[in-house]
């Protein structure tokens, strides 16, 4: 019988054979970490000769080559060192910005053994655009340098690098770029499980968070997040069973999928799971149309019963047919529920494709993805209703371009990955939804639908009142702590008489809580600068209230995300090593940052926070206020860097009773408190008993309106001191 020659050793590496030296056997080379095999594999032909994929000569000497990371092609508004053509494993590249530009991202990055840079793309930004500067990832070239609403930027990769992410991005109305950051990678690069798990987990937890979570329950077998909502999640698991997947790999695919199912069901959301194995044809083991798809035991049973031999007659990889079977399932469900019904439109869909190679039959899988996007009506508004995760396993035949084409593109998220082997995949699924890490992290979720009540839109918002009239506002930052202004308590009233009114789904009037303790910043003293002719000074205007009982989380009561915490980091979908500075650069990244506060009547009002040079011109108006500050020489004596400034242009101004309320912004459909309402030069509610009545200041008013808000980024030491065991703070 014909067999292939055995002189195929690789210097410095090892090889395995799928079927010995016989024709049809695949020889796969592997090298120690930090090296990659060239070629990666050979196939034993029926002629008894080894064939190397994409090689001109039939047999080149196999070698282990050193992995290298791509060099920057260009770096705007700054410099990088050292300047090399590519970088060795362990090599660093450092970035610095020119004057007037702030560095966002990682100032130093290191080349890792998988051919990927650690950290984040460094960007030198001056915050002038409607969207932040999207940067240029290492190895990429960008065309387009305007960052206004509707502007587009395009990316391509240099030489033989492969682009993953979005080749084109558009600056959207919400100040966020469409799609996901493009990364240029070596064709032989792969992802480490420790990078994929948090990336997948963060994206998934965002999807779960968007399902309007309510109560967390403690159970005897570990903690669970209980998520009750009107909507539903359909999870479709697609497992490659083609010839190139070994029985062993198929087993680990099954175990990984079971882990995923187990984790998802532990969130007690309304979930249906479909299981599809595929080779030349798909086989639906569980459909979302089957009532059993909602039962974890039945779903895991159908996974367990998936047989490796189910596809032994069809050995190709028909990814199109697998995705098309998902499309058909969706189509059937739509017909069943009715296309126009909320029951259909409120279902979120997540597809996880586990494959070991490129699709080699059945046509382009992208066609099926386009059909799926169309049937689900996926547009900018409904982008959150579909997530496709494309996970390639094994570095051999996996096609980066195809995976990237199939995976969803969402800002700050990754949906396409390549892992070294199935064991790496299993590690990812073990850690991606570690419930213990996610239980307390769902903050900043507000219901954005048109028919939501004001309280459902801003469920962190609370009213703080003494026995009689209402005085201040505040924000829930955990299930027992409220952040508010210190000046609310300046009369030194016994806080045992005060009440905090928190949203409650059972009552339009909310629910009243007693205060266990008030922690008022010791630095706050409204008369501290009286002898300098400053009649009122609001430095350190911050306080925390601990409620006498924990608040039951609901659609009407939920904490807002505090920046510089792990909880906010998850909501921002940032990598694990992020710092407080990273959060400030991401949230306050323009000279004029759109933000909101809550009015006395509960509605959400708009302001623009002025940063950088615009902060200076915003604050300077205070010198015209002669009543409160009769002989002010330096505005900074009153408006210290503890304050954010708003009130220019079309901004609304807060009323007196709105002090202490959150100044917040929206990022990626989650809400983050960056400040709290402190003081201002104009009270639009003065002289009005009606909560709904606000008077705009006349244009001729001197001084014009200005509002100042305590900047939470400047209060970090105090917040950490008092909330260190309540929230998980990031390094500064």
């Amino acid at each position: 019988a014909t067999s292939c020659p055995q002189n195929v050793n690789i210097s410095g590496g090892t090889f395995t054979l799928s079927h010995g030296w016989a024709p049809g056997s695949l020889l796969i080379y592997s090298c120690p970490q930090g090296l990659y095999p060239s070629p990666a594999s050979r196939l034993c032909k029926s002629s008894g000769q080894w064939q190397t994929p994409r090689a001109t000569r039939s047999l080149t000497k196999a070698v282990c080559k050193p992995v290298r990371c791509p060099a920057p092609v260009s770096f705007e508004n700054g410099i990088y060192t050292p300047r090399l053509g590519s970088y060795p494993v362990g090599g660093n590249v450092s970035f610095e910005c020119e004057d007037g530009f702030i560095l966002r991202g990682s100032p130093v990055r290191q080349c890792r053994p998988n051919g990927m840079w650690d950290g984040e793309t460094a960007v030198c930004d001056n915050g002038a655009g409607h969207c932040p500067n999207p940067g240029i990832s290492l190895g990429a070239v960008r065309t387009g340098s305007r960052f206004g609403h509707g502007d587009k930027v395009r990316y391509r990769c240099s030489s033989n690098l492969v682009l993953t992410g979005s080749a084109e991005r558009e600056c959207q109305g919400n100040g966020v770029w469409s799609g996901t950051e493009p990364i240029c990678r070596q064709p032989y690069s792969y992802d480490f499980p420790e990078d994929v798990a948090p990336a997948l987990g963060t994206s998934f937890s965002h999807m779960l968070g968007a399902t309007n979570p309510t109560q967390r329950t403690k159970e005897s077998l570990g903690r669970k997040i209980q998520i009750q909502r009107s909507g539903h999640l359909n999870l479709y698991l697609l497992l490659d069973s083609s010839q190139s997947v070994s029985e062993n790999d198929f087993l680990i695919f099954k175990e990984s999928a079971s882990l995923m199912v187990d984790r998802i069901f532990s969130f007690e959301i309304n979930v249906s799971v479909a299981i599809i194995t595929f080779a030349s044809e798909p086989k639906v083991l569980m459909s979302v149309l089957n009532v059993n798809s909602r039962d974890i035991t039945e779903v895991i049973s159908s996974l367990e019963n998936a047989k490796y031999k189910d596809h032994e007659n069809g050995t190709g990889t028909n990814t199109y047919a697998a995705l098309n079977s998902v499309y058909l399932m969706m189509n059937n469900q739509m017909q069943l529920l009715g296309m126009k019904t909320m029951a259909w439109q409120e279902i979120r869909h997540a597809i996880i494709l586990l494959t070991d190679g490129k699709s080699n039959m059945g046509g382009s899988p992208k066609t099926a993805v386009d059909q799926i996007r169309e049937i689900l009506n996926i547009n900018q508004k409904r982008n959150d209703y579909l997530d496709i995760y494309a996970i390639g396993v094994g570095k051999l035949d996996v096609d980066w371009r195809e995976l990237n084409e199939l995976g969803s593109k969402k800002d700050g998220e990754r949906h396409a990955f390549i892992l070294q082997d199935t064991k790496a995949l299993h590690q990812v699924f073990e850690h991606m939804l570690d419930v213990s890490k996610l239980t307390d992290t769902i903050c900043g979720v507000g219901n954005m639908s048109a028919n939501a009540s004001d309280q459902e839109r801003t469920p962190w918002h609370v009213t703080i009142k003494p026995k009689s009239q209402e005085t201040c506002r505040g924000a829930l930052i955990s299930d027992q702590w409220v952040l508010t202004a210190a000046h609310c308590f300046r009369d030194g009233n016994d806080h045992s008489l005060w009440r905090v009114n928190v949203g409650d789904p059972k009552s339009q009037w909310g629910k009243e809580f007693l205060i266990e303790k008030a922690v008022i910043s010791p630095g706050f003293d409204v008369f501290a600068k009286k002898n300098q002719g400053i009649l009122e000074f609001y430095g350190d205007d911050i306080a925390l209230l601990k409620l006498a009982q924990k608040v039951k989380m609901s659609t009407h009561a939920r904490p807002i995300c505090l920046p510089c915490t792990m909880e906010a980091n998850l909501a921002l979908r940032r990598p694990q090593g992020s710092t407080c500075r990273d959060h400030e650069n991401e949230l306050l990244n323009k000279q004029s940052v759109p933000a909101h506060f809550v009015a006395l009547n509960g509605s959400k009002l708009n302001i623009n926070l002025k940063m950088g040079v615009e902060w200076t011109s915003c604050a300077e108006v205070v010198s015209q206020e002669k009543t409160m500050f009769p002989n002010l020489t330096d505005v900074r004596e009153v408006v210290t860097d503890q304050f954010l400034c708003s009130g220019t242009q079309e901004d609304e101004s807060p009323c007196k009773g709105e002090s202490g309320g959150a100044v917040f912004l929206e990022r990626r459909f989650r809400f983050f408190q960056v400040g709290l309402v402190s003081w201002g030069l104009y009270n639009p509610c003065l002289g009005s008993a009606d909560k709904n009545s606000r008077k705009r200041a006349p244009r001729s008013k001197v001084p014009p309106p200005r509002d100042f808000h305590i900047n939470l980024f400047r209060m970090q030491p105090w917040l950490r001191q008092h909330l260190g065991d309540v929230l998980n703070f990031l390094p500064l």
Partner: antibody, heavy 119, light 108 residues
Framework: EVQLLESGGGLVQPGGSLRLSCAAS????????MMWVRQAPGKGLEWVSS????????NYADSVKGRFTISRDNSKNTLYLQMNSLRAEDTATYYC????????????WGQGTLVTVSS | QSALTQPPSVSVSPGQTATITCSGD??????VSWYQQKPGQSPVVVIF???KRPSGIPERFSGSNSGNTATLTISGTQAMDEADYYC??????????FGGGTKLTVLR
Amino acid sequence: EVQLLESGGGLVQPGGSLRLSCAASGFTFSRYYMMWVRQAPGKGLEWVSSIGSSGGTTNYADSVKGRFTISRDNSKNTLYLQMNSLRAEDTATYYCAKGGMVLGVVNIWGQGTLVTVSS
Amino acid sequence: QSALTQPPSVSVSPGQTATITCSGDKLGEKYVSWYQQKPGQSPVVVIFQDIKRPSGIPERFSGSNSGNTATLTISGTQAMDEADYYCQTWGTGGIQVFGGGTKLTVLR
């Protein structure tokens, strides 16, 4: 605390039958792959049989195929091994073990029950 | 049925490092568990999924698995570590496979 407690062992004549039980506690029994492993006196560990979480998938060592039947009752958190046509070489301590969800990666063992086949 | 091969015995002086190997075809692609069994007692998991140590198992126990060989390493071996050690993985067609066992002797 995760625990597996075997029972049902004892002395039986060749050709006889015995049913072993394994009561599980401290984990969600219905989610996990379970198996029986035995150890003849002075010998090593030998896998006997395994069963998937729902009971739909079963596997047996060649030495017991056709004679032993593994089953489970998820409502009672109990694993069973029905042993028929017993032989002298089946004499061993029988251990019940918990695997992964579909993999036989054992992470918990029972204390074992002794089965002696002798006339 | 695919077999796992272990050395029948390994001897080590107290405080030294003991290494027990387990070999099998493409073993690195599978997960390996290691069990410790002392006379008259049931087995105890010391390593699972190649490298994971259950709570309560001392840090001196570690595992690795690549190519065709899995290794159990006991650094700073103590007298109490004297026992039989078994490796285990899965084979084709749903079967489970155990190594023949290695008797670890800690020299007095």
